[in-house]
């Protein structure tokens, strides 16, 4: 049996849409299947890797690095995006290409990113993981560190940084995939929200649906513990 | 309101050692991404720039004069100072010191500048 | 080093005229960057990035250019315009300026 619940939520362009949350019932009436998962069932993604899942993270991984900041011209925000998602005429899409990226680091002028940009997050901004010496950031941006600590300013000059950010990862379903939405949208989803996150490659979201101990390497399932939990 | 102004001796002899500092105010230089740059100028000519150091200590020259040139900080004393050894007339110029700011740049530029400093090389 | 060569050296210009200031550099670059100055004067950004106008600055100023052709338009000379600009490139180490181009009042 499915339970379904709709509702008007915000979503990713600012605007309120009819949502639908589909939530598989438990036939025996008890606890939702992320339930019975956080409890741990015997659930094989949380014991060993899947393939089916592997293949979804890397496809939304290769997605990711494609994508840029898309920030609104009316100044109410920015979101990341894939450029096709990303209005021509109401928006300004923030990517990188060529010669317009910033140069790897301060030591390297000539090579210039191509990878980004990421709304809300900068390598030439964030203190901390500072990009510089033996630990700048790739040019890829789904091997960026979250940024815990940002250059004190108010004000960047940089489009993608100095927008309201509406959007961050959201771990959504059973199957860890994450989504790039408002904090509004991923708690109707009953997803988890990584508020400390910009892209979904700084998330494991596998990790969050499984609970428990967390994995020794977030990208590698190990509780075959499970065998004996349930 | 950011300022820097640049002191040092308006004179000095061939063969001696020039030492210029730059004091500032309005910025610290251990704020994340701040620099603070050398530039000069010889009577009627252009611009060339000398050396700069960044907020983590990381320094940079112009490699043609790069054996000459040191480029120091005092954080606490919101200063920076140039040393330039075996000073020629050639070197006769103004020097200035500029931050560096990359406010909305891919790069950096040099945003504020002292009123510069003239310095002869005269025997 | 890369190269800056500016034309022309030096230009006579009325007030109201438009004028254009070109910057070639010896290799490619991705970003030029512009300076005035006035006698006496330490130089002051107009433009950074090819097209960005520094704070402060008039929107008589514009920059545009890639690769190796630069330029610096004003698009209606003001009295206060008369001085001496400057090209800068921060591609590679070292920085290099061009030798200035003077502009003066005809």
């Known amino acids: 049996a499915q339970h379904v619940t709709t509702q008007l939520v915000l979503r990713n362009k600012g605007v309120y849409e009819s949502v639908k949350y589909i939530q598989q019932e438990n036939f025996w009436i008890g606890p939702s299947s992320i339930d019975l998962i956080h409890l741990g069932a015997k659930f094989s993604p949380c014991i060993r890797k899947d393939q089916q899942i592997e293949q979804l993270v890397l496809r939304e991984r290769d997605l990711e690095r494609d994508s840029g900041c898309c920030v609104q011209n009316d100044h109410s925000g920015c979101i990341q995006t894939q450029r096709k998602d990303c209005s021509e005429t109401l928006a300004t899409f923030v990517k990188w290409q060529d010669d317009t990226g910033p140069p790897m680091d301060k030591s390297d002028l000539g090579q210039k990113r191509t990878s980004g940009a990421v709304c809300h997050q900068d390598p030439r901004t964030c203190e901390e993981p500072a990009s510089s010496g033996a630990h700048i950031w790739p040019d890829d941006i789904t091997k960026w560190p979250i940024c815990t600590e940002q250059a004190k300013s108010n004000r960047t000059g940089f489009l993608h940084m100095d927008c309201q950010i509406k959007g961050r990862p959201c771990c959504i379903s059973t199957k860890g995939s994450c989504e790039i939405t408002t904090r509004e949208y991923c708690e109707f989803m009953h997803g988890y929200f990584h508020e400390e996150a910009t892209l979904c490659s700084q998330v494991h979201c596998l990790d969050k649906v499984c609970g428990l101990l967390p994995f020794l390497n977030p990208e590698v399932p190990d509780q075959f513990y499970r065998l004996w939990l349930s | 309101q950011v300022t820097l102004r640049e002191s040092g001796p308006a004179l000095v002899k061939p063969t001696q050692t020039l030492t210029l500092t730059c004091t500032f105010s309005?910025?610290?230089?251990?704020?994340?991404?701040?620099?603070v740059g050398w530039i000069r100028q010889p009577p009627g000519k252009a611009l060339e720039w000398l050396a700069h150091i960044w907020w983590d200590d990381e320094k940079y020259y112009n490699s043609a004069l790069k054996s000459r040139l040191t480029i120091s900080k005092d954080t606490s004393k919101n200063q920076v100072v140039l040393t330039i050894t075996n000073m020629d007339p050639v070197d006769t110029a103004t020097y200035y010191c500029?931050?560096?700011?990359?406010?909305?740049?891919?790069?950096?530029?040099?945003?504020?500048w002292g009123q510069g400093t003239l310095v002869t090389v005269s025997s | 080093a890369i190269q800056l060569t500016q034309s022309p050296s030096s230009l006579s210009a009325s007030v109201g005229d438009r004028v254009t200031i070109t910057c070639r550099a010896s290799s490619r670059i991705s970003y030029m960057f512009w300076y005035q100055q006035k006698p006496g004067k330490a130089p002051k950004v107009l433009i950074y990035d090819t097209s960005n106008l520094a704070s402060g600055v008039p929107s008589r100023f514009s920059g545009s250019g890639s690769g190796t052709d630069y330029t610096l338009t004003i698009s209606s000379l003001q009295p206060e315009d008369f001085a001496t600009y400057y090209c800068q490139q921060w591609n590679s180490y070292p920085l290099t300026f061009g030798q200035g181009t003077k502009l003066e009042i005809k």
């Open positions: 309005g910025f610290s230089l251990s704020t994340f991404g701040r620099g």
């Open positions: 500029a931050r560096i700011q990359n406010y909305g740049s891919n790069y950096w530029y040099f945003d504020v």
